[in-house]
Amino acid sequence: SGPLPKPSLQALPSSLVPLEKPVTLRCQGPPGVDLYRLEKLSSSRYQDQAVLFIPAMKRSLAGRYRCSYQNGSLWSLPSDQLELVATGVFAKPSLSAQPGPAVSSGGDVTLQCQTRYGFDQFALYKEGDPAPYKNPERWYRASFPIITVTAAHSGTYRCYSFSSRDPYLWSAPSDPLELVVT
């Protein structure tokens, strides 16, 4: 018999956690698991419980996590990795829309995330979307072109800036930008 199926690992309420705010990491396997192992990758840190409650996020807790479980002598495959990001480590960038935040359906718009610091990575989030758009950019300004805009692009956007040297330590979010598709 092969390895047991992998568990799921999630961060609640979100894997983007402002410094000093709480977050819970939860490893979910099948019923009746004997032992869970939740580990922080690239370190020697772990715990043998399914739930890790972090009462106040710290820089040192940011990073990649994964979990697995044991039944009898068999270990499961590891979960997909979870990237736990500390936000608010740096000042917020600014987010703007070119030519403007109101765009006609079928038109083009570019969202630009700009910081005065030397960050080389940017992430753009649309409220309600599970994952960010990421864009490496050398010159402290990241452009996210949206070609042929549709009504689905309407919504509230925020961006973050960070460094590839510390990819789990992010800025505070930009002020929200409301994109209106007419």
């Epitope: 922080k40 370190s43 020697s44 840190r45 772990y46 715990q47 043998d48 890790l52 409650f53 972090i54 009462p55 106040a56 710290k58 040192s60 807790l61």
Partner: nanobody, 126 residues
Amino acid sequence: QVQLQESGGGLVQAGGSLRLSCAASGFTFDDYAIGWFRQAPGKEREGVSCISSSDGSTYYADSVKGRFTIARDNAKNTVYLQMNSLKPEETAVYYCAASPLYYSGSYCRETEYDYWGQGTQVTVSS
């Protein structure tokens, strides 16, 4: 709110003793490893002694073995560091720190601890 409050520092003569206390609040104390660290003037912070959450296993820096004792009282949410036969070179600010994760290494590493107290000054005069 996570808080660690050290107390028990002060001025002591070489060869004397002090007992430091670290009172914790704002988290489930039983689940956390606790470490004592110190930073002497002009030097880097170093691990002195740590105690795990799971089995109460302890670590001591070589320089303090046989003289320092770490103990935890989960009922009082407090960890103690009994320091005997103190030396002038042990003058430093002593910090306690907490970690919700175990560390599989055999020593206290500053990077493995997430929550820190403000420190208490220990001065050992000759």
